[in-house]
């Protein structure tokens, strides 16, 4: 089933390669088990930036080597993505799936247009 | 529960002719994107054609011209003619349902492009070969 998800149209990345936004998405029914991806579209191409699934009330789990992190509460998922450089400028999608109990709900938000901008490197004191 | 059930795969001849159907059923979306995807012997998935729920159509460069997509909103069903096959053509083709249009028009020309659509048909076979 359809499943509406929001997200901000465009966030800046911190000078420290950071960028942070809100995942929302309006589930239709009393989900306990919830999964996440975020999903990067550039140059004509998707990938998977990260996964997480989680249980309703609890924290949620990237792997080990992820480079996102994020907390959960109610229906809103804050994401934070770090290690970011300016090649990594792009469009980043929230993919959510309702995964139990039945029936499966899946929602993709617009996107997030996130800009990253390298800091210039500071110039050496003689 | 989504069902997707493709039929009207087959073995046909280079140059000739099949139908492809996926009927759906248990779906309520007021928009949406319908697609038709393949996936080659030890080849990833790749979106071979896409329809919205306002009947806007898009192809992959690779079948543009000979493939039409279309879909029959009274029997819930979403139709693949491919005409001018070639043995390139040979694959598993999967029906898909996205909930987002707005990715809808550029995934037939989107590596990864999968990652949209989240449900999916068990697939029918389509070998070009003489």
């Known amino acids: 089933k359809a499943m509406h998800v929001a997200q901000p149209a465009v966030v800046l990345a911190s000078s420290r390669g950071i960028a942070s936004f809100v995942c929302e998405y309006a589930s239709p029914g009393k989900a306990t088990e919830v999964r996440v991806t975020v999903l990067r579209q550039a140059d004509s191409q998707v990938t998977e930036v990260c996964a997480a699934t989680y249980m309703m009330g609890n924290e949620l789990t990237f792997l080990d080597d992820s480079i996102c992190t994020g907390t959960s509460s109610g229906n809103q998922v804050n994401l934070t993505i770090q290690g970011l450089r300016a090649m990594d400028t792009g469009l980043y999608i929230c993919k959510v799936e309702l995964m139990y109990p039945p029936p499966y709900y899946l929602g993709i938000g617009n996107g997030t247009q996130i800009y990253v901008i390298d800091p210039e490197p500071c110039p050496d004191s003689d | 529960e989504v069902q997707l059930v493709e039929s009207g795969g087959g073995l046909v001849q280079p140059g000739g002719s099949l139908r492809l159907s996926c009927a759906a059923s248990g779906y309520t979306y007021s928009r949406h994107c319908l697609g038709w995807f393949r996936q080659a012997p030890g080849k990833g998935r790749e979106a071979v054609s896409t329809i919205d729920s306002g009947g806007s159509t898009s192809y992959a460069d690779s079948v543009k011209g000979r493939f039409t997509i279309s879909r029959d909103n009274a029997k819930n069903t979403l139709y693949l003619q491919m005409n001018s096959l070639r043995p390139e053509d040979t694959a598993v083709y999967y029906c898909?349902?996205?909930?987002?249009?707005?990715?809808?028009?550029?995934?037939?020309?989107?590596?990864?492009?999968?990652?949209?659509?989240?449900?999916w048909g068990q697939g029918t076979l389509v070998t070009v070969s003489s």
């Open positions: 898909a349902i996205g909930p987002n249009p707005r990715y809808c028009s550029g995934a037939p020309n989107t590596r990864g492009a999968e990652h949209y659509f989240g449900y």
